[in-house]
């Protein structure tokens, strides 16, 4: 069985890239190295992802179960309030934040914390798994 | 609302050792990304980097200045304390400290985005 | 040790003049990472220095709009375009871009 899914046969779960993590219905990757924000916005893009833009207080507790103290970069800016990239607000959690130059978000296991944009930290892409090649 | 605070002994005599606290509030320094920073402005001249403590007690000196200085935090109390040894009428200065923002580099590139209003010592016999 | 060189040392304006100060940097002062940390500070009297502008062009929360800067590689700008009694004070430049970290001897602005 497909952990996470409700997919009954291997075969037939859509699947995650290798070093990317299948939970729930999408795939997430963790950096093993460190980039600025905008550095690891790109590895998402590029990767056809995104920076980890969490939708609900249930998604940030499953995923804070596999962070440490270690901050990781997250799809979250303050321009004018912090905004997820897909442009919601972010609403259903607080975001520790102490600086006006601290525009950029990011998560560990404790919870969000603001931080500048180029500080180099470890990051989070998010993406939909694609079906199994082999089937096509 | 951040606010910071400088307090000292206003007169040391030459070669005795200088004990400066800065106690803030408005952020804790156990805080991911946050600083304190001691800088100097002796009487009619520039300003003048001195030391800085993060957030995970890693600190940073002026070379010049390096054997004679020691930082130290108390996350638990707000405050942060500069010692300086052998203090010589050159010291002279307002001491100030300011909040320090983490850029990346434990040792340079951040922003001292608040600062205290200061502390004069003036080191005379 | 970098060396910030501000000029003038001395700036007597007109309110509601504008007000132009450079700071210039023995050499550049761009980080590896791209970035340019170059700061910019207000020394009012009797007060303590408060961060104006950061990473060159960047207003601090608060700074009013008429304050401006600019710049790159070793030469930078702060401007005023409409001086107002309540700037008076000392500017200082400050590069954190490289160890050790250094500030500019500092403009007096005053007015005429």
């Known amino acids: 069985l497909c952990q996470g899914s409700n997919y009954s046969t291997c075969a037939s779960c859509p699947s995650c890239p290798d070093r990317w993590m299948k939970y729930g219905n999408h795939c997430y990757y963790f950096s093993v190295e460190e980039k600025d924000w905008n550095s690891s916005l790109e590895f998402c893009l590029a990767r056809d992802s995104h920076l980890l833009v969490i939708t609900d207080n249930q998604e940030m507790s499953l995923l804070q179960v596999f962070l440490s103290e270690a901050f990781c970069w997250i799809g979250l800016r303050n321009n004018s309030g912090w905004r997820w990239e897909d442009g919601s607000p972010l609403n259903f959690s607080r975001i520790s934040s102490n600086s006006f130059v601290q525009t950029c978000g990011a998560i560990n296991k404790n919870g969000l914390q603001a931080s500048s944009c180029e500080v180099p930290l470890h990051w989070v892409c998010k993406k939909c798994p694609f079906a199994d090649q082999a089937l096509f | 609302q951040v606010t910071l605070k400088e307090s000292g002994p206003g007169l040391v005599k030459p070669t005795q050792t200088l004990t400066l606290t800065c106690t803030f509030s408005?952020?804790?320094?156990?805080?991911?990304?946050?600083?304190v920073g001691w800088i100097r402005q002796p009487p009619g001249k520039a300003l003048e980097w001195l030391a800085h403590?993060?957030?995970?007690?890693?600190?940073w000196y002026e070379l010049a200045l390096k054997s004679r200085l020691t930082i130290s935090k108390d996350s638990s109390k707000n405050q942060v304390v500069l010692t300086m040894t052998n203090m010589d009428p050159v010291d002279t200065a307002t001491y100030y400290c300011?909040?320090?923002?983490?850029?990346?580099?434990?040792?340079?590139?951040?922003?001292?985005?608040?600062w205290g209003p200061g502390t004069t010592v003036t080191v005379s016999s | 040790d970098i060396l910030m060189t501000q000029s003038p040392l001395s700036l007597p304006v007109t309110p509601g003049e504008p007000a132009s100060i450079s700071c210039k940097s023995s050499?550049?002062?761009?980080?590896?990472?791209?970035?340019?940390?170059l700061e910019w500070y207000l020394q009012k009297p009797g007060q303590s220095p408060r961060l104006l502008i950061y990473?060159?062009?960047n207003r601090f929360s608060g700074v009013p709009d008429r304050f401006s800067g600019s710049g790159s590689g070793t030469d930078f700008t702060l401007k005023i375009s409409r001086v107002e009694a309540e700037d008076v004070g000392v500017y200082y430049c400050?590069?954190?871009?490289?160890?050790?970290?250094?500030f500019g001897a500092g403009t007096k602005l005053e007015l005429k």
């Open positions: 300011a909040r320090v923002i983490y850029y990346g580099s434990r040792s340079a590139y951040y922003s001292m985005d608040y």
């Open positions: 408005g952020f804790s320094l156990s805080t991911f990304g946050m600083g």
């Open positions: 403590i993060w957030w995970d007690d890693d600190k």
């Open positions: 050499q550049s002062i761009v980080h590896s990472n791209g970035h340019t940390y």
């Open positions: 990473k060159v062009s």
């Open positions: 400050f590069q954190g871009s490289h160890v050790p970290v250094t």
